[in-house]
Interface confidence: medium
């Protein structure tokens, strides 16, 4: 693999915890320089597999609010605006990292946590199981 | 509002940085216990707005590998398997948190960074702008 020399200006690490507990600066750097600031796009209404956005809030987590997509229909919306059950609306899921306060209610101590969130829905052709 | 008492067992905070710099335990807790192991599903191929997955790797970031979706077509796949340009394939984007080594190459010091990733694609009705 690539061996990158350690920066001599790094903070000291306590060997017993290293590198399990690290220092993290919460002043977030935003790489999304060229994105449209109006990010709450209306795809959730315009999609052929539309979805609702449900709030998932946990004050012990950072970010505290996550919006979860729930597909509105089992099928997909056809050209006539009706639900076509020959197709399926399915959630697109992604694993994301969040910070969980640990111990609970501590403002400056967290643990990394991985959670699975549904980001939106897409319309797929169903898998048909033929009975012999 | 809700006032939750601070846990007396919290690590001390250095006031000059608090709460900008926090301690984070990197032993990841995975909440996805009851999820379907077939998460790397074939939706990207079966969708009416199919997508390709591109690997984005950065050793100075945690997680170092992120998969980015790119829609295959401008239009959507119709019932005949052809691309219908009266509909649009669009990426569903999600802002995620990652850890960026800061200063660079330091094993135990990070900064939170948010990046916008495309998770998959969905098929939407286009917005038609009528010219007066």
């Amino acid at each position: 693999g690539i061996t990158i020399p350690r920066n001599p200006g790094c903070p000291n690490s306590e060997d017993k915890n290293f590198p399990r507990t690290v220092m993290v600066n919460l002043n977030i750097h935003n790489r999304n320089t060229n994105t449209n600031p109006k990010r709450s796009s209306d795809y959730y209404n315009r999609s052929t597999s539309p979805w609702n956005l449900h709030r998932n809030e946990d004050p012990e987590r950072y970010p505290s609010v996550i919006w979860e997509a729930k597909c509105r229909h089992l099928g997909c919306i056809n050209a006539d605006g009706n639900v076509d059950y020959h197709m399926n609306s399915v959630p697109i899921q992604q694993e994301i990292l969040v910070l969980r306060r640990e111990p609970p209610h501590c403002p400056n101590s967290f643990r990394l946590e991985k959670i699975l969130v549904s980001v939106g829905c897409t319309c797929v052709t169903p898998i048909v199981h033929h009975v012999a | 509002g809700i006032t939750i008492p601070r846990n007396p067992g919290c690590p001390n905070s250095e006031d000059k940085n608090f709460p900008r710099t926090v301690m984070v335990n990197l032993n990841i807790h995975n909440r996805n216990t009851n999820t379907n192991p077939k998460r790397s599903s074939d939706y990207y191929n079966r969708s009416t707005s199919p997508w390709n997955l591109h690997r984005n790797e950065d050793p100075e970031r945690y997680p170092s590998v992120i998969w980015e979706a790119k829609c295959r077509h401008l239009g959507c796949i119709n019932a005949d398997g052809n691309v219908d340009y009266h509909m649009n394939s669009v990426p569903i984007q999600q802002e995620i948190l990652v850890l960026r080594r800061e200063p660079p190459h330091c094993p135990n010091s990070f900064r939170l960074e948010k990046i916008l990733v495309s998770v998959g694609c969905t098929c939407v009705t286009p917005i038609v702008h009528h010219v007066a």
Epitope: L26, N56, E68, P107 | P19
Partner: antibody
Framework: QVQLVQSGAEVKKPGSSVKVSCKDS?????????MSWVRQAPGQGLEWIGD????????FYGEKFEDRVTLTADTSTNTAYMELSSLRSEDTAVYYC?????????WGQGTLVTVSA | DVVMTQSPLSLPVTLGQPASISCKSS???????????LNWLQQRPGQSPRRLIY???KLDSGVPDRFSGSGSGTDFTLKISRVEAEDVGVYYC?????????FGGGTKLEIK
């Protein structure tokens, strides 16, 4: 106790813009709690404008306001901002910032914006 | 969008008597995480709104225990066991389960 202190009343001409600020006294949690903006026209009910997570800059807008409102935050001063452009007479209202767990637990004192020719 | 319908529009109550306000939503407010993000606000004349209840039934700190919230799914109720003079104002229900957030039209509580 959390205190949200908003900027003073404004009188604006139709077509112009207004920027309302909201300073949060709670330096401990504010960078990682959503800040919401709500408005109330004279004698009317409450209307949600949008949310911003100050530290992330993650923004959600109500559809009605999406084209005209810009929410921003300065985490170094714990201040959130709401800018509304292309003002019309029906934008005359008291604008509130609010934040806290599970929705709006704490509210600012409100900023009256009057749009008049 | 979720429509929140409050009743009654106006509620005249005698001091010391109970009061009840109903709030109905056009779709279930049970979130994907099992929580129901239904809240009640009080707005006294000339003041900013103040949250009384969150997650259907949890009282905010400093809210007298004569206030209580109940309900599930699409039907919710705010009750005041014994109305006091300081309770005069407009009460709003609002949901933050679904995007975008929506408020009820308000119920004006006044003393008979």
């Amino acid at each position: 106790q959390v205190q949200l202190v908003q900027s003073g009343a404004e009188v604006k001409k139709p077509g112009s813009s207004v920027k309302v600020s909201c300073k949060d006294s709670d330096s401990t949690f504010s960078p990682i709690v959503y800040m919401s903006w709500v408005r109330q026209a004279p004698g009317q009910g409450l209307e949600w404008i949008g949310d911003i997570l100050p530290s992330l800059g993650r923004i959600f807008y109500g559809e009605k306001f999406e084209d005209r409102v810009t929410l921003t935050a300065d985490t170094s001063t714990n201040t959130a901002y709401m800018e509304l452009s292309s003002l019309r007479s029906e934008d005359t209202a008291v604008y509130y910032c609010a934040r806290g767990d599970y929705g709006f637990a704490y509210w600012g004192q409100g900023t009256l914006v009057t749009v008049s020719a | 969008d979720v429509v929140m319908t409050q009743s009654p529009l106006s509620l005249p109550v005698t001091l010391g008597q109970p009061a009840s306000i109903s709030c109905k939503s056009s779709q279930s407010l049970l979130g994907s995480d099992g929580k129901t993000y239904l809240n009640w606000l009080q707005q006294r004349p000339g003041q900013s709104p103040r949250r009384l209840i969150y997650l259907v039934s949890k009282l905010d700190s400093g809210v007298p225990d004569r206030f209580s919230g109940s309900g599930s799914g699409t039907d919710f109720t705010l009750k005041i066991s014994r109305v006091e003079a300081e309770d005069v104002g407009v009460y709003y229900c609002w949901q933050v389960t679904h995007f975008p957030y929506t408020f009820g039209g308000g119920t004006k509580l006044e003393i008979k």
